[in-house]
Interface confidence: low
């Protein structure tokens, strides 16, 4: 069982290495933002036993403007690189970041991993707050090793919350 792509979090990105059940991944606050104390960037692929559908737990992460970087212009909303270019993780700046999650992985690759179609765009998003098949859980202290590791990195773009149909410049979502 695999999870679909995780929801996006305002001012944060996530690069999913494994979509397998019990995989644990971390969101990274965008440049110019840092993790608010007391919030967690962790999300885990879990199974809703009532529906037998896997989904990502909702992270408590809040990315706030980094006061140390107020003199800099905030980075524009993230977008996926265009056709033929595989998104790669950026080097992480130390401010306000949690340590990266360690994900032991096996050699069994690609069977259940997801990948973005080259040339496709990710839309700005708002995190659903509640849902029929969504269950929230506290971070467990025990980490289950990821069963599958993605060869291709996936970048989930996020942007500031906008009213439906209104998007930051550079995005198009006509209906």
């Amino acid at each position: 069982i695999t999870c679909p792509p995780p929801m996006s979090v305002e001012h944060a990105d996530i690069w999913v290495k494994s979509y397998s059940l019990y995989s644990r991944e971390r969101y990274i606050c965008n440049s110019g933002f840092k993790r608010k104390a007391g919030t967690s960037s962790l999300t885990e692929c879990v199974l809703n036993k009532a529906t037998n559908v896997a989904h990502w737990t909702t992270p408590s992460l809040k990315c706030i403007r980094d006061p140390a970087l107020v003199h800099q212009r905030p980075a524009p909303p993230s977008t996926v690189t265009t056709a033929g270019v595989t998104p790669q993780p950026e080097s992480l700046s130390p401010s306000g970041k949690e340590p990266a999650a360690s994900s032991p992985s096996s050699n069994n690759t690609a069977a259940t991993t997801a990948a973005i179609v080259p040339g496709s765009q990710l839309m700005p998003s708002k995190s659903p707050s509640t849902g029929t098949t969504e269950i929230s859980s506290h971070e467990s202290s025990h980490g289950t090793p990821s069963q599958t590791t993605a060869k291709n990195w996936e970048l989930t773009a996020s942007a500031s919350h906008q009213p439906p149909g209104v998007y930051p410049q550079g995005h198009s979502d006509t209906t």
Epitope: M123, S125, P128, G131, T133, D173
Partner: nanobody, 124 residues
Framework: EVQLVESGGGLVQAGGSLRLACAAS????????MGWFRQAPGKGRDFVAG????????VYTGSVKGRFTISRDNAKNAMYLDMISLKPEDTAVYYC?????????????????WGQGTQVTVSS
């Protein structure tokens, strides 16, 4: 409430192709991220492919990448899954799914509407 009805399933030989369709009725279809899941006999329901509200963003699980193509026609309130080079392991009931609360065109985060499913059987 969005109602979803799948069609297009059937029996096909390995290497063959099928086109599944999902007809949606209800509000704001064009803003709902949608996707296809499948459930093989005795197994859980797995994510297959997802598409953003606009249709620009598409994502696939690795085992179908290059063989399956998800698309949607918002004018017709329809979503499709074109499947080629089918394999016996693709045999499953295929479900159309929607995230109707998330109306800004992003990926499925929480599925709250399901179709009844359509059976796809690939014989060797």
């Amino acid at each position: 409430e969005v109602q979803l009805v799948e069609s297009g399933g059937g029996l096909v030989q390995a290497g063959g192709s099928l086109r599944l369709a999902c007809a949606a009725s209800g509000r704001t279809f064009s803003k709902n991220p949608m996707g296809w899941f499948r459930q093989a006999p005795g197994k859980g329901r797995d994510f297959v492919a997802g598409i953003s509200g606009s249709g620009f963003g598409k994502v696939y699980t690795g085992s179908v990448k290059g063989r399956f193509t998800i698309s949607r026609d918002n004018a017709k309130n329809a979503m499709y899954l074109d499947m080629i080079s089918l394999k016996p392991e693709d045999t499953a009931v295929y479900y159309c799914a929607a995230d109707t609360r998330n109306r800004d065109g992003t990926w499925i985060g929480v599925v709250d509407s399901w179709g009844q499913g359509t059976q796809v059987t690939v014989s060797s």
